[in-house]
Interface confidence: medium
C-alpha cells in the first residue's frame, strides 16, 4: 500500500479563525511516519479553518528528521487558498533520526524571525507533531525554556503509531512530548493512536489555538 494517502474522514464544519497569530508548524518527517498523506490531510483540515493573510493569521511550516527544512516562511503566502495548495505539496523528507530539539530550536531561532515574516507584537504559536522520542532529548529542556523565554505558545502532538505497531511502551515518549507543550499541559498536549487519527483532533486543536487571541 502507498506511503502516501489522502485521509478522507469527514470532520466538523469549518470554523474560521480571523485573529492575528504567527503560527509555525513543526513536522516530524522521519521514516517512521506512515502514511504521510495523513499528515498532509491533517494540515489541510487545520489550515482551512484559518483566515490567513498579512494582517490576519500567518503560517509557516518546518519539517525535521535528521535535518531541518523550512517548507515555507510565515510571509510566503497571503491567503488560505495559497497555503492549502503549498501544504498539499509537502513531501516527506525522511531520515532515520528524530531530532525534535533541533526542529523546535530552528523554528524558534529562524522561522520566528522578522526576516521570515514574523510580526512584532503578534502572538507566536508553535505546533509540534512527532511520532518518536527525540535523538537529541538532552537538548530539549534548554530549547523549551528558550521558547518559554520568547513567549512562544506550544501545542505538541504525539503520534503513537510506530509504538503501537511495534508493541513498544509509549510512557517515556508521551512524557517527553508533554514536556514540550505549554502549561496547562492538558490544554496544549494531544496524543493520537496513529497517523490516520490525526484528523480527529483538528477541531479541538483549532479551537484551542484560536482561543489564544480571545
Amino acid at each position: 500500500v502507498s506511503p502516501t494517502f489522502q485521509v478522507v474522514n469527514s470532520i466538523a464544519p469549518v470554523q474560521e479563525c480571523s485573529t492575528q497569530l504567527d503560527i509555525v508548524i513543526v513536522l516530524d518527517g522521519s521514516n517512521s511516519i506512515y502514511p504521510w498523506d495523513s499528515v498532509t490531510a491533517f494540515l489541510n483540515d487545520l489550515l482551512e479553518r484559518m483566515d490567513i493573510g498579512p494582517k490576519q493569521t500567518q503560517v509557516g511550516i518546518v519539517q525535521y528528521g535528521e535535518n531541518v527544512t523550512h517548507e515555507f516562511n510565515l510571509n510566503k503566502y497571503s491567503s488560505t487558498e495559497e497555503v492549502l495548495v503549498a501544504a498539499k505539496k509537502i513531501v516527506q523528507r525522511g531520515g532515520r533520526q528524530t531530532m525534535t530539539a533541533l526542529g523546535i530550536d530552528t523554528a524558534r531561532k529562524e522561522a520566528f524571525t522578522e526576516a521570515r515574516g514574523a510580526r512584532r507584537g503578534v502572538k507566536k504559536v508553535m505546533v509540534i507533531v512527532t511520532d518518536g522520542e527525540s535523538h537529541d532529548n538532552h537538548r530539549l529542556k534548554k530549547v523549551i525554556q528558550d521558547c518559554e523565554d520568547e513567549n512562544i505558545q506550544r501545542f505538541s502532538i504525539a503520534i503513537l503509531g510506530s509504538y503501537n505497531r511495534g508493541n513498544l511502551s509509549t510512557e517515556k515518549f508521551v512524557e517527553e512530548i508533554k514536556s514540550i507543550a505549554s502549561e496547562p499541559t492538558e490544554k496544549h498536549f494531544f496524543n493520537v493512536s496513529d497517523e490516520l487519527a490525526l484528523v480527529t483532533i483538528v477541531k479541538t486543536l483549532g479551537e484551542r489555538i484560536f482561543a489564544l487571541e480571545a
Epitope: 502507498s2 506511503p3 474522514n9 521514516n31 525522511g94 503509531g161 505497531r165 490516520l196
Partner: antibody
C-alpha cells in the same frame, strides 16, 4: 505461520449490506495495517481502503466513501469490512491484505499477505 | 489517480521459454524517500494474489529466482527466465507511491 482467514461466500439482494470478516494469526495483529481489495469478475484488482488495527482509524478510497465501514476487534485479531447499499456491480471477490512493514523507523512494502478471498454475489 | 497499463493482456508461452510483462505508469513512481514503490503479484487460477516482487526488484521469500523485476521511473518489467507449468496465472503490477494505490489490469500467462 502468518495467515489471514476470511468468512464464507455471501449472496445478497440489491440495497442490502454485507459484512466480511478477516481473522489474522501468526503475527502481532496491531503491528500491521490491513487493507481491503476487491476483484470483480474478469476485472483487475481495486483497492478499497485501510484500517489501523491498533487505533481503529480508517482511510477509504473515494469511490467507496459513505458506503464502506472498516472495523476491528483486537480481542479476536479480526478486521471487518461492511459494504452497504449493494448493487450488482459490487459482485466480486473481496480480499483482506496486510501492509508489509520493515520495523520501527522503517519502510512499508506493498501487500505482503492476502486472505483467501470472500465471494459476494449481489442478485435480485 | 495514477493509471497503470500492462502489456500484453495475454502471453501464451512455451514451457521452458522466457516471458516478459511490461507495466507503465502515467507518472513517475519515485517517492520522495528515493524508493520506487512498484510491486508485482501473481494470481494462480482459483487462488489469492501472492506478492512476488516488492520495490521493483526485491524477491519475496520463497519466490523462485527465475522471476526478476526491473525498471525505473514509469517503465517496469517482470521477466520469467524459463516458464514452468506452475507459473500459469495472472500477473499484476501495483504502485504504492501515489494516492490511492492502483493496480495494472493484469497479464494472463498461459501455456501454448
Amino acid at each position: 505461520q502468518v495467515q489471514l482467514v476470511q468468512s464464507g461466500a455471501e449472496v445478497k439482494k440489491p440495497g442490502a449490506s454485507v459484512k466480511v470478516s478477516c481473522k489474522a494469526s501468526g503475527y502481532t495483529f496491531t503491528s500491521y495495517y490491513m487493507n481491503w481489495v476487491r476483484q470483480a469478475p474478469g476485472q483487475g484488482l481495486e483497492w478499497m481502503g485501510i484500517i489501523s488495527p491498533s487505533g481503529g482509524s480508517t482511510t477509504y478510497a473515494q469511490k467507496f466513501q459513505g458506503r464502506v465501514t472498516m472495523t476491528r476487534d483486537t480481542s479476536t485479531s479480526t478486521v471487518y469490512m461492511e459494504l452497504s447499499s449493494l448493487r450488482s456491480e459490487d459482485t466480486a471477490v473481496y480480499y483482506c491484505a496486510r501492509t508489509g512493514y520493515s520495523g520501527y523507523e522503517g519502510y512499508y512494502y506493498g501487500l505482503d499477505v492476502w486472505g483467501q478471498g470472500t465471494t459476494v454475489t449481489v442478485s435480485s | 489517480d495514477v493509471v497503470m497499463t500492462q502489456s500484453p493482456l495475454s502471453q501464451p508461452v512455451t514451457l521452458g521459454q522466457p516471458a516478459s510483462i511490461s507495466c507503465r505508469s502515467s507518472q513517475s513512481l519515485v517517492y520522495s524517500d528515493g524508493n520506487t514503490y512498484l510491486h508485482w503479484f501473481q494470481q494462480r487460477p482459483g487462488q489469492s494474489p501472492r506478492r512476488l516482487i516488492y520495490k521493483v526488484s526485491n524477491w519475496d521469500s520463497g519466490v523462485p529466482d527465475r522471476f526478476s523485476g526491473s525498471g525505473s521511473g514509469t517503465d517496469f518489467t517482470l521477466k520469467i527466465s524459463r516458464v514452468e507449468a506452475e507459473d500459469v496465472g495472472v500477473y499484476d503490477c501495483m504502485q504504492g507511491t501515489h494516492w490511492p494505490s492502483t493496480f495494472g489490469g493484469g497479464t494472463k500467462v498461459e501455456i501454448k
